[in-house]
């Protein structure tokens, strides 16, 4: 069968090969489409309700004035010429509708680095067959379920027209230290070949880095670093960089002889542990970075501890956690 694609609403003419150019003709058209139950036979004499949908022209061709979704199917013509030679024509008709330009709706103008964000929803209305939506970042296709990209898709069909509405919601996790203004776009690819994709206007949200790129953060438990004698202090060095750098510890400006670890525990605090602590993160790409210094002090019973975030240090009954 010869494949024919026709746009919905447009006229279609199918030739009946081997048919005499004008009557008298011996030919019949057989249709098996969404409008027929099994095969329907049409002859040049025609007439009746089918004429508004499909009719045989004087030259034997079949004319459909406005193709619809129900006209998809098989069309066959069997013709006999003046010499009694039989010719068969066989067509497989598929219909299509190109939707309006897709749009990104409900789009975010800010994204947060390091966490999942909804970028927006791409909507395409009025396609047939359904087709597909795909997302692009800086012109390159985004692959769902890769590198923090996820897509939620929905396809709806109009109850009367039979045309499709596609929706695609994009979620991304922007990398820390990445592009502060990535460009996203979405494109509709038709379900039938030989039709080019339709692309939305791009959107360019700003990326917010809520955890500092460059700073090494030192978190102290208990807050403020003041503890009763015999208590425990936990120092945690938080570094947003990937891959995780090596973390070393300093007390009063001097490196502590401990294996690298992001956590430093000072159990059973004594006077020798008091002092100013900091951590140093060493990245392969850009050298060592030191955190703020925190002060570790012992509160004698009845004393009030210093306020949270005061600057100060530690001592050596220490334990490093991998």
């Amino acid at each position: 069968a010869q494949n024919i694609t026709a746009r919905i609403g447009e006229p279609l003419v199918l030739k009946c090969k081997g048919a005499p150019k004008k009557p008298p003709q011996r030919l019949e058209w057989k249709l098996n489409t969404g409008r027929t139950e099994a095969w329907k036979v049409l002859s040049p004499q025609g007439g009746g309700p089918w004429d508004s949908v499909a009719r045989v022209l004087p030259n034997g061709s079949l004319f459909l004035p406005a193709v619809g979704i129900q006209d998809e199917g098989i069309f066959r013509c069997q013709a006999m010429n003046r010499n009694g030679k039989e010719t068969k024509s066989n067509y497989r008709v598929r219909v299509y509708q190109i939707p309006g330009k897709p749009e990104i709706v409900d789009s975010a103008s800010e994204l947060t680095a390091g966490v999942p964000n909804k970028v927006g929803t791409c909507v395409s209305e009025g396609s047939y067959p359904a087709g597909t939506l795909s997302w692009h970042l800086d012109g390159k296709p985004l692959v769902p379920n890769e590198k923090g990209v996820s897509v939620k898709e929905q396809t709806r069909r109009h109850p009367e027209t039979g045309l499709f509405t596609l929706q695609s919601e994009l979620m991304v996790t922007p990398a820390r230290g990445g592009d502060p203004r990535p460009t996203f776009s979405c494109s509709f690819s038709p379900g039938l070949p030989r039709h080019r994709a339709l692309r939305t206007a791009p959107i360019q949200p700003r990326v917010w880095e809520p955890v500092p790129l460059e700073e090494v953060q030192l978190v102290v438990e208990p807050e403020g670093g003041a503890v009763a004698p015999g208590g425990t202090v936990t120092l945690t060095c938080e570094v947003p960089a990937q891959p995780s750098p090596q973390i070393h510890w300093m007390k009063d400006g001097v490196p502590l002889p401990l294996p690298p670890s992001p956590v430093l525990i000072l159990p059973e605090i004594g006077p020798q542990d008091q002092g100013t602590y900091s951590c140093v993160a060493t990245h392969s790409s850009h050298g060592p970075q030191e955190s703020r210094a925190v002060s570790i002090s012992i509160i004698e019973p009845g004393e009030e501890g210093p306020t949270a975030g005061s600057v100060g240090g530690s001592g050596l009954g220490t334990l490093a956690l991998a």
Epitope: A108, T112, W208
Partner: antibody, heavy 113, light 107 residues
Framework: EVQLQQSGTVLARPGASVKMSCKAS????????MHWVKQRPGQGLEWIGA????????YYNQKFKGKAKLTAVTSTSTAYMELSSLTNEDSAVYYC??????WGQGTTLTVSS | DIVMTQSHKFMSTSVGDRVSITCKAS??????VAWYQQKPGQSPKLLIY???YRYTGVPDRFTGSGSGTDFTFTISSVQAEDLAVYYC?????????FGGGTKLEIK
């Protein structure tokens, strides 16, 4: 340590313009958005706009377009906000904030005749 | 612009209590909500972003939850130093908009 040092209290006449500064230290100035926020006495917070000092890209709250102008000088790591055609409604504390995580101490602007 | 509504202007609580502050967005903002603390005479301080992510160095008694239009900020065990005004802010769309603030008073 990251610090944002804002210029001191400003007293201005209605109709005048003022330019306040926010000097950044302790981080790479060109790598972060600098936002500006308004807080009227006893009121909530209002976002004015932001500038990316790396390429001077700015974006504004529509409400403050024509009122506020954001600039940045990378050589001194200083962000500026100029407010024009001042009215009593502009009397407020103005904060600069680096990416919402570090904030300046605020500049108090009083507009009075 | 997206309107952020904090229904309680004031909340009174005691040290050690659990307190929750709510915030409602006028349209879907996914999980793009941050919470700030502003103590008297001080600049605001970022506590929570993207609805539930605690900012670096923020004590774990502060938590956030919610998505879409309804968000909650909780202090599991209120301390005296938590006396402050708490603001929600959507960071989904420009302009960023804040709630009116909830002042936490310690009994």
């Amino acid at each position: 340590e990251v610090q944002l040092q804002q210029s001191g209290t400003v007293l201005a006449r209605p109709g005048a313009s003022v330019k306040m500064s926010c000097k950044a230290s302790g981080y790479t100035f060109t790598s972060y958005w600098m936002h500006w926020v308004k807080q009227r006495p006893g009121q909530g917070l209002e976002w004015i706009g932001a500038i990316y000092p790396g390429d001077s890209d700015t974006y504004y709250n529509q409400k403050f377009k024509g009122k506020a102008k954001l600039t940045a000088v990378t050589s001194t790591s200083t962000a500026y906000m100029e407010l024009s055609s001042l009215t009593n409604e502009d009397s407020a504390v103005y904060y600069c904030t680096r990416n919402w995580d570090y904030w300046g101490q605020g500049t108090t602007l009083t507009v009075s005749s | 612009d997206i309107v952020m509504t904090q229904s309680h202007k004031f909340m009174s609580t005691s040290v050690g209590d659990r307190v929750s502050i709510t915030c409602k967005a006028s349209q879907d903002v996914s999980t793009a909500v941050a919470w700030y603390q502003q103590k008297p005479g001080q600049s605001p301080k970022l506590l929570i972003y993207s609805a539930s992510y605690r900012y670096t160095g923020v004590p774990d008694r502060f938590t956030g939850s919610g998505s879409g239009t309804d968000f909650t900020f909780t202090i599991s065990s209120v301390q005296a130093e938590d006396l402050a005004v708490y603001y929600c802010q959507q960071h989904y769309n420009t302009p960023r908009t804040f709630g009116g603030g909830t002042k936490l008073e310690i009994k």
